[in-house]
C-alpha cells in the first residue's frame, strides 16, 4: 500500500530545460512515500535505516539522503600546539645518578629549579604554557626537554607558533650566554654552558579547515569551498547563502549535484524562469523579456 | 621533606668565636648540598659557605675566607659554622639552607630548603 501526501506543487525548471515537478513546501519531500519492501534498499548514499527514518553521511541529508548539504561543519581545535625539542647544558648542578630516576627527591627538586628558570626565561611569550624535561644526563647536567606553546586557533596560526619558537629559540640562546659560571660558581638560579644549547626538533600542530572541507565533501570535494566568518571556517557549498562564494539563483532553488551547483528556476501562474542564474523571466500571457 | 633546625647563635665580643650548627632530617640520600647565608638588617641575603656532603666541594665567599670554617657530620646529619676573628660587619641573623642537589650557585633562589635562622650580635 501507499501513503499519499497531498501537497500543492509547484514546477521547477534546471538551467537545462527539464521541468520537475516538485512540493512547495520542501523540496527534499516526497509526494508519495513506500512504507512497504526493504527499507534498507530506500536510504541512498551509504545511508542506514535506523528502524524510524534513514541515518545519512556526511554530506548527504533527506528522507532518503539523496540530497546534498549547502555546509559541512568542521570543528577546527579550540587550541592549536607546538612543541620544541630543545636541550641545555646546566653547569651550576653536578650530575649524580638519582637524576636519571624521575620520582627521586633530586630529580624532583631539579625539576622544580629547571622549571621555574624556563618560567622566568619565557615569561614574555603569550603562547608558552611549560617545559617537561624528557632525560637528565652526564655532562654536567644535559637537560634533554620539550618547551609546549599553545594558541588559540586562527587561520594564521602557523604564523603565530613560528614567531613563537623564534622567541624561543633567541630567549633560551641569550640565557645560556649570560648566565654562566664565574670563578667555578654561578650567582643566577642556574647557570648553563653556552655551547650546549641546541634545537632538536619542532613540531607544529596541523590542521587544514580546507582538507578537512574537501574530505568531508567526498565526490563533492571540487564544489565545495572554506570561507572564514569571524576567523572561524565554513565548509560550503555555493548554494550556502550570505557568503562570497554563494550563487544567486534569483527566481530559482540552489541545488548540488556532481556537476557542481545548478539553479533550478520555478515557474509561477504568472511568470516562467530561465537562465543559469534564474534571472530571465517571461510573462505567460504577453511573451516577453524583463529583467 | 627536609627539615633543618639551626642552633648556636649569640652575642659575641669582636675578635671572639661562636660556633652555629644546623640539623638536617629528611634527605633520601647521603649526597647533598648544604649552606650558610646571612642576612644583615637592611641588606639582601648573602652566601657565607656552603659545602657538599660527599667533600667534593666546598665554597666560601671572599669576606670570610681564613675565619669562617664549614664543616658537616655525616654521621649527625649535622652542618657547622665554626666562626672565629668575629668583626662587627659579621652581625646578621644566620640561615641555614640545604638542595638534594650538588649545588654550585651562591644564589639563595636555587636553594630550596631553609632553617628558621639564628641571631649573631658582634659587639663591645
Known amino acids: 500500500p501507499l501513503a499519499t501526501i497531498p501537497v500543492s506543487t509547484t514546477s521547477l525548471t534546471s538551467s537545462e530545460g527539464s521541468t520537475i515537478s516538485t512540493p512547495s513546501v520542501d523540496i527534499s519531500t516526497p509526494v508519495t512515500t513506500s512504507i512497504v519492501g526493504d527499507q534498507c534498499s530506500r536510504c541512498k548514499n551509504g545511508g542506514f535505516w535506523d528502524g524510524l527514518k534513514c541515518q545519512c553521511l556526511t554530506p548527504y541529508y533527506g528522507e532518503s539522503c539523496e540530497e546534498v548539504v549547502n555546509s559541512i561543519d568542521i570543528a577546527p581545535p579550540e587550541t592549536v600546539s607546538a612543541q620544541m625539542e630543545l636541550t641545555v647544558t646546566v653547569t651550576s648542578v653536578k650530575f649524580t645518578d638519582e637524576l636519571k630516576n624521575h620520582s627521586s627527591q633530586e630529580f624532583r627538586e631539579f625539576n622544580k629549579t629547571f622549571t621555574e628558570q624556563m618560567n622566568i626565561v619565557y615569561s614574555g611569550i603569550p603562547e608558552y604554557v611549560g617545559v617537561n624535561i624528557t632525560n637528565l644526563r652526564l655532562g654536567s647536567v644535559v637537560v634533554e626537554h620539550d618547551v609546549l606553546l599553545r594558541t588559540k586557533y586562527t587561520p594564521e596560526y602557523k604564523t603565530a607558533l613560528d614567531n613563537a619558537t623564534e622567541v624561543v629559540k633567541q630567549k633560551i640562546t641569550k640565557v645560556t650566554t649570560e648566565q654562566i659560571m664565574t670563578n667555578d660558581n654561578c650567582s643566577a638560579l642556574m647557570c648553563f654552558n653556552t655551547t650546549g644549547t641546541q634545537v632538536q626538533n619542532i613540531t607544529v600542530t596541523q590542521y587544514d579547515p580546507v582538507e578537512e572541507c574537501r574530505q568531508k565533501a567526498e565526490e563533492y570535494e571540487d564544489y565545495f569551498l572554506v570561507e572564514y566568518r569571524d576567523q572561524k571556517p565554513y565548509c560550503i557549498s555555493p548554494c550556502e547563502s550570505g557568503f562570497n562564494a554563494s550563487k544567486n539563483c534569483n527566481h530559482g532553488k540552489c541545488q548540488m549535484s556532481q556537476n557542481g551547483a545548478r539553479c533550478l528556476c520555478v515557474t509561477t501562474e504568472t511568470h516562467w524562469y530561465s537562465g543559469e542564474d534564474c534571472n530571465q523571466g517571461t510573462q505567460k500571457s504577453h511573451h516577453h523579456h524583463h529583467h | 621533606d627536609v627539615q633543618l633546625v639551626e642552633s648556636g647563635g649569640g652575642v659575641v665580643q669582636p675578635g671572639g668565636s661562636l660556633r652555629l650548627s644546623c640539623a638536617a632530617s629528611?634527605?633520601?640520600?647521603?649526597?647533598?648540598?648544604m649552606a650558610w647565608f646571612r642576612q644583615a638588617p637592611g641588606k639582601e641575603r648573602e652566601v657565607v659557605a656552603f659545602?657538599?656532603?660527599?667533600?667534593?666541594?666546598?665554597y666560601y665567599a671572599d669576606s670570610v675566607k681564613g675565619r669562617l670554617t664549614i664543616s658537616h657530620d655525616n654521621a649527625k646529619n649535622t652542618l657547622y659554622l665554626q666562626m672565629n676573628s668575629l668583626r662587627a660587619e659579621d652581625t646578621a641573623v644566620y640561615y641555614c639552607?640545604?638542595?638534594?642537589?650538588?649545588?654550585?650557585?651562591?644564589?639563595?633562589?636555587?636553594?630550596?630548603?631553609w632553617g628558621q635562622g639564628t641571631m649573631v650580635t658582634v659587639s663591645s
Open positions: 639552607a640545604a638542595s638534594s642537589l650538588l649545588l654550585q650557585t651562591i644564589n639563595p633562589r636555587a636553594w630550596p630548603y
Open positions: 629528611g634527605y633520601t640520600s647521603n649526597r647533598y648540598s
Open positions: 659545602i657538599w656532603t660527599d667533600g667534593g666541594r666546598t
